[in-house]
Structure formats: structure tokens, C-alpha cells
Amino acid sequence: SQPQAVPPYASENQTCRDQEKEYYEPQHRICCSRCPPGTYVSAKCSRIRDTVCATCAENSYNEHWNYLTICQLCRPCDPVMGLEEIAPCTSKRKTQCRCQPGMFCAAWALECTHCELLSDCPPGTEAELKDEVGKGNNHCVPCKAGHFQNTSSPSARCQPHTRCENQGLVEAAPGTAQSDTTCKNPLEPLPPEMSGTMLM
């Protein structure tokens, strides 16, 4: 056989040395170069010439080393599906989209295709923090001891109870998971019908 270092070269077992940057071309029974990201095959390889690549036209891309004869068309992020753009399309990368604030990915096919509104977390709970924003719906967890959250909201966080003594006040009513501590001026008694958190 003829030992050759660069494509096109003969392949008896139908595999190529560099699987990422080369591919097996079955008609000629050889290994040929793939085209780099941002390009496509403008002329196929043969035993006498390697693949000829050309740059993707504007508004098209190829992300990987490939032997595609066309570039993929750039697609905008669809706001109707709840998506927004985080990075524009380039010849080497498709448009990068994510779910709009307050939404999560409800349909995933290699990438997010449809976002839905995050569920509200009821008072006394907050959304569990996730590694990646928009990846899944809210999972509401109770506020930890000494914290409260008093709204129905997809994004409100549990806050620490007010420490009355830090403000020179005294506790009138203890805080709960759904309400803050009620403080009062140490010199005045708090009328029972008053529900404000602080009385000065």
C-alpha cells in the first residue's frame, strides 16, 4: 500500500485516523478531510483530490467539522415560544436562545423549542435555586427557619425575619414562614388590631 500522511488516503477498514476532522468516503474507499466549522463542501473528494471547502454565506452556519454540501440557515429566537436571543448567529454557531425571564423550558429537542411561565411559589415558600436558569419549572421549598415569604410569586425569595432589637425595638409578634416579625416601641403597648410590622 501507499503510506500517506494527509487525506485523501486509502482505508481498508473503513475508519479514518482523525474521526473529528476526516470521514470515510465509500465510493472511492478513502479517507477525506471534513470541512471546518463555518464552511461546507463545495467539491467532493476523490482519490486524486481532497475535499474543497467554502465559507458559509451570510445568515447561514455549520457548527462542526462536516462533509455537508450546504450550510444550515440561521433561525431567530421565537418570542411567541417564549424565547429570547443571548448571542447572534455566526458562520460557526447558530443563534443562541434562552427562555425569557419568568419562564422555563417546557419542550426540549437538542435545544429548547418552547418556554412556559414559571409556576408561582405560595407564601411561605420559594423556588429552589437551579444550576441553570430556565431549565425547568419551579420546585417550591419551604422558607428555612428565621425566614419568610409573603407573596404568590415565581421569583420572590425568602427574606430573614426582622431583628427588632437591631432597630431599638421589641418583638410584638414572632415571625412565621409567611410573615415578618412584628416590632413595637418598647414604651408603647401595641393595640391588638394593628398588624403593621413596626410601630414608631
Epitope: S1, H28, R49
Partner: antibody
């Protein structure tokens, strides 16, 4: 001893169909790419079709693409060429040919040929 | 398609004579050229592959040379058994294409 024996040739009217067969013996048929070549009455040699060792890939020149279909049965050691929409220019001797399976890609064995005549 | 121009189309030569047939490719075919001998009423038979390599069982009086676009088949000392038509074939790029053939006869 490698043997390739073609059959199925004959006289057919323009627009008609014909199926050629090639019985292979003396080698491991499923290890080789197989071809059909033809030789016109003017003695010009032409490539007609290629099929890969496992039968997954088939290739044709533009002159027969869409009209001819190459296939193989590795269990029976048989190669086939289904020809349809035949034209007078398809008149030729058809050869079943083996491509060597090393790195030089030459055609090491040819059958004796079968004659196809397309005429009204 | 790569055009293969073979010459001469026919020739007469004497026994013992040195005979050369040439083939010119329309572009560089990087030695992916083989030579075939066809006797009357027989199928083609491989003589030379990869431009210069002698196929198994072929007499050593046959040899091939050339590179790039230009190739030749030489019979060093013609024998009566060499009466035949000789074809070159490029298999560097599909579609594979043959030369028009050279009909060799004894004077």
C-alpha cells in the same frame, strides 16, 4: 479459482426492462465491491454501476442513473443489474467485475459477459 | 469527467519489437491508472495497476510508466500472443473512464 458468470442478456425493445445476474465463486463475495461495466458495439468500455461490499452504497454514471439498479445477495453470492427504460445506446456486452479490496482499486477479475441488444 | 486520450488507436508491429502505447489524462490522476488487455471474443484482463505495478501472472515483458497526466504501457519484445486491444482506465475520480483502446496486430 475466481469465477464470475453473467446471465440474463437478450433482445429487448426500447423502453423495455431486463435483469442481469452474475454468479460469483472462488472468493469471499461479501468482502468485495462489485461493478458492472459494458462494452459498446464500437468497442468502447464504460462504467455502469458500483455496489459496496455490504450492499449499502450504490453508484451510477449520469447516463444510467434512475434507470438501472445494482443489487447483491451475499448469501447467494449473486450480483444483479435491473435495467429499465432501455434505450438503443444501452446495447452492449455487460461485464460483471470485481474490484480488488486493497489500496490500489484496480479491477482484477472480469466475467465472460452477457449481450444486451435494445432494438425495435 | 476525466477524459482519457489513448494513442495510437491501432498499430502493427513485428515480433520481437518494442511497443509503446500512451494514455493522457485530462488532469493529474496521481497514478490511479491501470492497463487491460482484451483478446478477440474475450473479456478484459488486468496487466498493470497503479501505473507501474505488474499484476499477478502477467509476463515481465509488460511494463507501465508515467505519472501526473501522462502514462504508457510498454511491451519490451512483442510476441504473437500479444495480439489484442489494450485499454487504459483511470480510477482516481468517479466516473471511471477508459481510453478508446489500441488495437495491436502483428506485421
Amino acid at each position: 479459482e475466481v469465477q464470475l458468470v453473467e446471465s440474463g442478456g437478450g433482445l429487448v425493445k426500447p423502453g423495455g426492462s431486463l435483469k442481469l445476474s452474475c454468479a460469483a465463486s472462488g472468493f469471499t463475495f461479501s468482502d468485495y465491491y462489485m461493478y458492472w461495466f459494458r462494452q459498446t458495439p464500437e468497442k468502447r468500455l464504460e462504467w455502469v454501476a458500483t455496489i459496496s461490499d455490504g450492499g449499502s452504497y450504490t453508484y451510477y454514471p449520469d447516463s444510467v442513473k434512475g434507470r438501472f439498479t445494482i443489487s447483491r445477495d451475499n448469501a447467494k453470492n449473486n450480483l444483479y443489474l435491473q435495467m429499465s427504460s432501455l434505450k438503443s445506446e444501452d446495447t452492449a456486452m455487460y461485464y460483471c467485475v470485481r474490484e480488488e479490496n486493497g489500496n490500489f482499486y484496480y479491477f482484477d477479475y472480469w466475467g465472460q459477459g452477457t449481450t444486451v441488444t435494445v432494438s425495435s | 469527467d476525466i477524459k482519457m486520450t489513448q494513442s495510437p488507436s491501432s498499430m502493427y508491429a513485428s515480433l520481437g519489437e518494442r511497443v509503446t502505447i500512451t494514455c493522457k489524462a485530462g488532469q493529474d490522476i496521481k497514478s490511479y491508472l491501470s492497463w487491460y488487455q482484451q483478446k478477440p471474443w474475450k473479456s478484459p484482463k488486468i496487466l498493470i495497476y497503479y501505473a507501474t505495478r505488474l499484476a499477478d501472472g502477467v509476463p515481465s515483458r509488460f511494463s507501465g510508466s508515467g505519472s501526473g497526466q501522462d502514462y504508457s504501457l510498454t511491451i519490451s519484445s512483442l510476441e504473437s500472443d500479444d495480439t489484442a486491444t489494450y485499454y487504459c482506465l483511470q480510477h482516481g475520480e468517479s466516473p471511471w473512464t477508459f481510453g478508446g483502446g489500441t488495437k495491436l496486430e502483428i506485421k
